[in-house]
Structure formats: structure tokens, C-alpha cells
């Protein structure tokens, strides 16, 4: 259940809308029910009620990252900020917009060809899969020095959804992010109250697949707000 997970695992540094009063992690436990994933694994979420507060990058939209709004500001107050475009300064990959990654403090394109002379860890890490570069999914040609990288499979660690193979997205799983299947019709999904605001999700679900949207299940219309079940449904 949500209670058992939140009580058994310390969740700290959350802004008040998520974590309750400062210094009392997880005090907003009653905010949301535990929901069983169709597959059976536990899943928890706490909805965010204020605009874009966050504790981690993955709680923000795909074109955002989580940081203090003021330079050198209070680290305890973080919000979702717009991602940084190519050639802008950065400190980590998530700060850069999709299709880019952070290299030497600058957002650079992850589409450009990489050469062996570069540090391999930097190259492969931009794809979130540096542990699968040899016998796993990276293939190098002997004729060219360019490196080709195949996307992460289900269960692979990732940084963002573009790191994952088709039909998968990059979603929170405990203290990491891994490639998980995009949701199919009829599967339970998470409806976020505010665009870009992902709340706290210990076992985060992917979004609904193409042609599907996350809506309240018809037979759950009468249920209370907090217990409404959302599923992926045809538009």
C-alpha cells in the first residue's frame, strides 16, 4: 500500500505540497490511495496541487528540469523550469532539451556523430545505457570510427524516454529510472492534475500509447475524486 511504502522509505527534501510540513517527510501520505498496476506490481502517486513544485527532474515535463528558480537560491524550494537549448550552459543531462545532452557544461546535440577519440563514458551516458555498450546494444563498425547505439530494452536504466526502444518510456522505479512499456488500451494510467506536474511516483507508469488518452474509467464516475480509476482509452 501507499502507506507502507511511504512509511518504510524516507522521502525527504520534498516541497510542502508533496512532503507536508518541512522536516516531516511523507506527512501527506493520505493524499492518494495505492493503486494496483494491471500487472500486479505496487504503484503509488501523490498529486501535486501547486504549480510545478518538484524534487527531481522526472517529476517535470519532458521539456523541463527541476531546480531552484533563483541562482544560488534555497535548495529546498525547487520548481520545474524550461529545458535549456543547444549551446546553453548546463550541469546535468536533464537540464538540456530532448535531443541534447550535457557535455563539458554545455548542451550539445545527441544526434551528432560521435568519434572514438571522445571519452566513451560521456558518449554512452548520454543515452543512459553506458553499461550495455559492448556485447549489449552498441555496435561499432571497423570501417568507420562512428559509434552506433541501439536503444535500451525494458528494464534498462535510462535518463529520458529517447534512451528507450520503441514502445517504451523512461519512468521512475525506486531510486532509478528504467525503460518501461508504454501503456496499452485498458491499462491503468496516471492522470496528473497539472501539466508537467508528475507528483511523487515510486513506480511511475508510462504514458498511454498513440491514439489513447488517460481518462476516468466509466464505471468509476461515481467514486470519490481521490479513488477514481483512470485507464488508457481511445480518443
Amino acid at each position: 500500500t501507499l502507506n507502507s511504502v511511504l512509511n518504510s522509505n524516507a522521502i525527504k527534501n520534498l516541497p510542502p505540497p508533496l512532503g507536508g510540513a518541512a522536516g516531516h517527510p511523507g506527512s501527506a501520505v493520505s493524499a492518494a490511495p495505492g493503486i494496483l498496476y494491471p500487472g500486479g506490481n505496487k504503484y503509488q502517486t501523490i498529486d501535486n496541487y501547486q504549480p510545478y513544485p518538484c524534487a527531481e527532474d522526472e517529476e517535470c515535463g519532458t521539456d523541463e528540469y527541476c531546480a531552484s528558480p533563483t541562482r544560488g537560491g534555497d535548495a529546498g524550494v525547487q520548481i520545474c523550469l524550461a529545458c535549456r537549448k543547444r549551446r546553453k550552459r548546463c550541469m546535468r543531462h536533464a537540464m538540456c532539451c530532448p535531443g541534447n545532452y550535457c557535455k563539458n557544461g554545455i548542451c550539445v546535440s545527441s544526434d551528432q556523430n560521435h568519434f572514438r577519440g571522445e571519452i566513451e563514458e560521456t558518449i554512452t551516458e548520454s543515452f543512459g545505457n553506458d553499461h550495455s555498450t559492448l556485447d549489449g546494444y552498441s555496435r561499432r563498425t571497423t570501417l568507420s570510427s562512428k559509434m552506433y547505439h541501439t536503444k535500451g530494452q525494458e528494464g534498462s536504466v535510462c535518463l529520458r524516454s529517447s534512451d528507450c526502444a520503441s514502445g517504451l518510456c523512461c519512468a521512475r522505479h525506486f531510486w532509478s529510472k528504467i525503460c518501461k512499456p508504454v501503456l496499452k488500451e485498458g491499462q491503468v494510467c496516471t492522470k496528473h492534475r497539472r501539466k508537467g506536474s508528475h507528483g511523487l511516483e515510486i513506480f511511475q507508469r508510462c504514458y498511454c500509447g498513440e491514439g489513447l488518452s488517460c481518462r476516468i474509467q466509466k464505471d468509476h464516475h461515481q467514486a470519490s475524486n481521490s479513488s477514481r480509476l483512470h485507464t488508457c482509452q481511445r480518443h
Partner: antibody, heavy 115, light 108 residues
């Protein structure tokens, strides 16, 4: 190349405290969740604790909850495990490892709890 | 908690032989969130397989992982002298993360 080096182990009396450190290099530290795993002498592996890339989320095994605290200093590329109220059954080699399935491991540091 | 039971506890084989190690979960792992590790005496474990079937960096092609649900298998197609070690499976699908008790592959 990715390297993880643990330190801080040693002999401590029951009820005592120790702080383990894990210095990371060769990768962008704050992009990865980190994990502590232990192995009692002659026994199997046991997951102890995990922490997200920013340090915002921490997780603990029931056996150490309330006694151990995982933390990280991303400016120093270092992972920590503060161990309080140590018991004889905490005697083990403690490994730090990267991410949720442990793709890189340190060499381990031995913690012995004995009177 | 999901309990992982590995069998056999010990596997006695000769170099060149095929090794099949089993890892059975007490509950269905609805996603392939299972990893395999190799550990030699006095050394840290080494990741071999993640996501049930994906080989990690530098792991030879003779190692392969398969399975789903409750039954997972690590296969070493042809044992090399350096493969004699203890192998652990680990699930990262549910809380808490758990390991199997290990299978020791020894020289016959």
C-alpha cells in the same frame, strides 16, 4: 572508466556507529541512483539502501530502517552510509554500487561489530 | 517480499559443458526486472545480465538470460575455466529488492 571506492569500515562495538563513504569517478555521478549492498561472511548478498540521483529519495531494507541513513554529496561525487546502533548481525562486507541493478561495484569495505 | 530461490545450490561441471542455472520467484515478476551476477571469492560481484536477458558491458556471448513470470534462467553455453564462481539472481521489480541465495558452479 567507472570506479567506486569504499572506505570507513572497521571494528566497532555493538551499539556503536560508523560512517561509510564511497568515492565515485568516471561517470556523471548525479545522473545515477546509488545503492548499498552487504554480504555477511560466507553468506549471500543483501540489499541495504538506495538513493536517487539528486538525493531526494531514499529507500531502506527493513533490517536497517531507523538505524542507517544513506546520503550523497554530488559536489564531491561521494555516497555515504551512516550506520548507528550497530548489531552483531550487521557484520559484513559493504559494497556501494551504481543504479538499481548494480552495473558497477566498489571493492567493498569490511564492517565488524563485536565486543 | 519476493523470495528468489536458486537451484541447484551447487553445480559440478567440466569446462566446455553447458551450465543452466535456475532462479524461481515466489511471486510473478510482471516485468523482466531481473539481474544476474557472478562473484568469485574475495571479489565484488559483477553484473552479467539485466532486464532478464540483456548482457552487460564486456560480458561474453556465452552468457545468456531468459525467462519471465516466476521462472528465470542463466545459461552458460560452454564453460570456460574463469566461469567457475557463484552466481546470484536479483529482482528489482518490487519492494524490497531481493537476491537469490546463490548457485555455486564448481569444477567437476
Amino acid at each position: 572508466q567507472v570506479q567506486l571506492v569504499e572506505s570507513g569500515g572497521g571494528l566497532v562495538q555493538p551499539g556503536g556507529s560508523l560512517r561509510l563513504s564511497c568515492a565515485a569517478s568516471g561517470f556523471t555521478f548525479n545522473n545515477y541512483g546509488m545503492t548499498w549492498v552487504r554480504q555477511a561472511p560466507g553468506k549471500g548478498l543483501e540489499w541495504v539502501s538506495g538513493i536517487s540521483g539528486s538525493g531526494s529519495y531514499t529507500y531502506y531494507a527493513d533490517s536497517v530502517k531507523g538505524r542507517f541513513t544513506i546520503s550523497r554529496d554530488n559536489s564531491k561525487n561521494t555516497l555515504y552510509l551512516q550506520m548507528n546502533s550497530l548489531r552483531a548481525e550487521d557484520t559484513a562486507v559493504y559494497y556501494c554500487a551504481r543504479t538499481i541493478y548494480m552495473d558497477y561495484w566498489g571493492q567493498g569495505t569490511l564492517v565488524t561489530v563485536s565486543s | 517480499d519476493i523470495v528468489l530461490t536458486q537451484s541447484p545450490a551447487t553445480l559440478s561441471l567440466s569446462p566446455g559443458e553447458r551450465a543452466t542455472l535456475s532462479c524461481r520467484a515466489s511471486q510473478n515478476l510482471f516485468s523482466p526486472y531481473l539481474a544476474w551476477y557472478q562473484q568469485k571469492p574475495g571479489q565484488a560481484p559483477r553484473l552479467l545480465i539485466y532486464g532478464a536477458s540483456n548482457r552487460a558491458t564486456g560480458v561474453p556471448a556465452r552468457f545468456s538470460g531468459s525467462g519471465s513470470g516466476t521462472d528465470f534462467t542463466l545459461t552458460i553455453s560452454s564453460l570456460e575455466p574463469e566461469d567457475f564462481a557463484t552466481y546470484y539472481c536479483q529482482q528489482y521489480g518490487d519492494e524490497p529488492i531481493t537476491f537469490g541465495q546463490g548457485t555455486k558452479v564448481e569444477i567437476k
